[in-house]
Interface confidence: low
Amino acid sequence: EEELQVIQPEKSVSVAAGDSATLNCTVSSLIPVGPIQWFRGAGPGRELIYNLKEGHFPRVTAVSDPTKRNNMDFSIRISNITPADAGTYYCVKFRKGSPDVELKSGAGTELSVRAKPSAPVVSGPAVRATAEHTVSFTCESHGFSPRDITLKWFKNGNELSDVQTNVDPAGKSVSYSIRSTARVLLTRRDVHSQVICEVAHVTLQGDPLRGTANLSEAIRVPPFLEVTQQSMRADNQVNVTCQVTKFYPQRLQLTWLENGNVSRTEMASALPENKDGTYNWTSWLLVNVSAHRDDVKLTCQVEHDGQPAVNKSFSVKVSAHPKEQGSNTAAENTGTNERNIYGGSG
């Protein structure tokens, strides 16, 4: 008598999540009489997937009618595949008995489920950093299968190399997650820069997923300060200018001090943007020279984005013997921009 063969022609089948999977199985003979059952896994803990004899299996259907006496095709179709369905499926022939006795198993078909990665989510540092500092960005994507995946980082189109990437779990799983950290060196020109995390996977058919983050959320560009005196006006008033340039973000408060006393405080708002994304701001202070006997020390104090204030000082020289009101008494520029004693930048 010819030995019964249980033939599973495909060693492996790969299916996209949500699709149906067809698992093929044929037998070489209908003798001896007995049922065919499908199991996932082998050994005593195997899971019954389909019993062609009877039972209710909502997601599994027989490809051919198993009740037909001459049917030797016991292939099944599993609908709406999820990553949890991955595994090796065995078509097993039993001899009818009390209980049924397992006669022969097919070689098994490994079902792998292709699941798309989720859209990459890029997150940046919690606090802003200044130029010439390095900040970290993280990118996460989940739920993909198989495990093989490629993740690349770009800054303004240029691939980044200071990158650390992990795919979890390390062992076999129904689906995987990827987490990558990129270290980015900030420059003063990075307000308009963007980092992109690009994920490529077999399920994406060459159309990678991208997550982005704007460096404008991560960078602080501290301002340059310059205090200058305009020419003396006919009414003995000196126009002193504080130019605050190349700063980002816009959040900035400027205070004028006359001989250490607050003269005026202003908040920057609705400033025009420079091409590089930074801002400039100019503030003027009119000093009535005739109202002062001694030199006037003017200080432009700038507090940018909650950082410690930066000062720039300027002395307006008042003549020791002022002429009559209305005469052309000069206010002299000392030519020294005095630095703030607690470490402002000039």
Partner: antibody, heavy 118, light 107 residues
Amino acid sequence: EVQLVESGGGLVQPGGSLRLSCAASGFTLSSYDMHWVRQAPGKGLEWVSAIGTAGDTYYTGSVKGRFTISRENAKNSLYLQMNSLRAADTAVYYCVRGGVWDDAFDIWGQGTMVTVSS
Amino acid sequence: DIQMTQSPSSLSASVGDRVTITCRASQGINNYAAWFQQKPGKAPKSLIYTASSLHSGVPSKFSGSGSGTDFTLTISSLQPEDFATYYCQQYVSYPYTFGQGTKLEIK
């Protein structure tokens, strides 16, 4: 109608034996994994034993070597032979059908009380 | 053996309330978690299998969720007949194990 009816419970002395039966109707018992689950008075549920469609048997640690699960396909019945009974075995014993899709319990019998006492 | 830890062990609620019972497995069990309802003197009734699938005839006010180690049973709007003891169970590997039960009482 799919139904499971247990019988065979009763009072037995420690060290004694008892055989529980579970008669199945409305389905073919041999096509399903079948289980025994027990519940001591005022306590929670405890899985005791199972028999698979291929006749493979499984037991919880405390009954291994003392209890034997079996079935008789001709009578569409499940059995639990309990030997060397202890007071700790006192419980209501339920016969339960494991669903064919993934062996999730779907049908429960009404239970039979086993009391082990001297 | 896989331990199933259920919480809370008892719960008081009113008719119309939404209640959630949780169950944690000592190791991953994929989605092989089931939930049962038992009333005094009666056999347990199967409610949910594979974590979220409702058994035939079970009303949709019962719902389950979870995967891996953490699972929940939610009853969306309590009715008088829902006051009972609820058990979770893992059936990924032998020996199958149950949670210790949650007794749902009328407030």
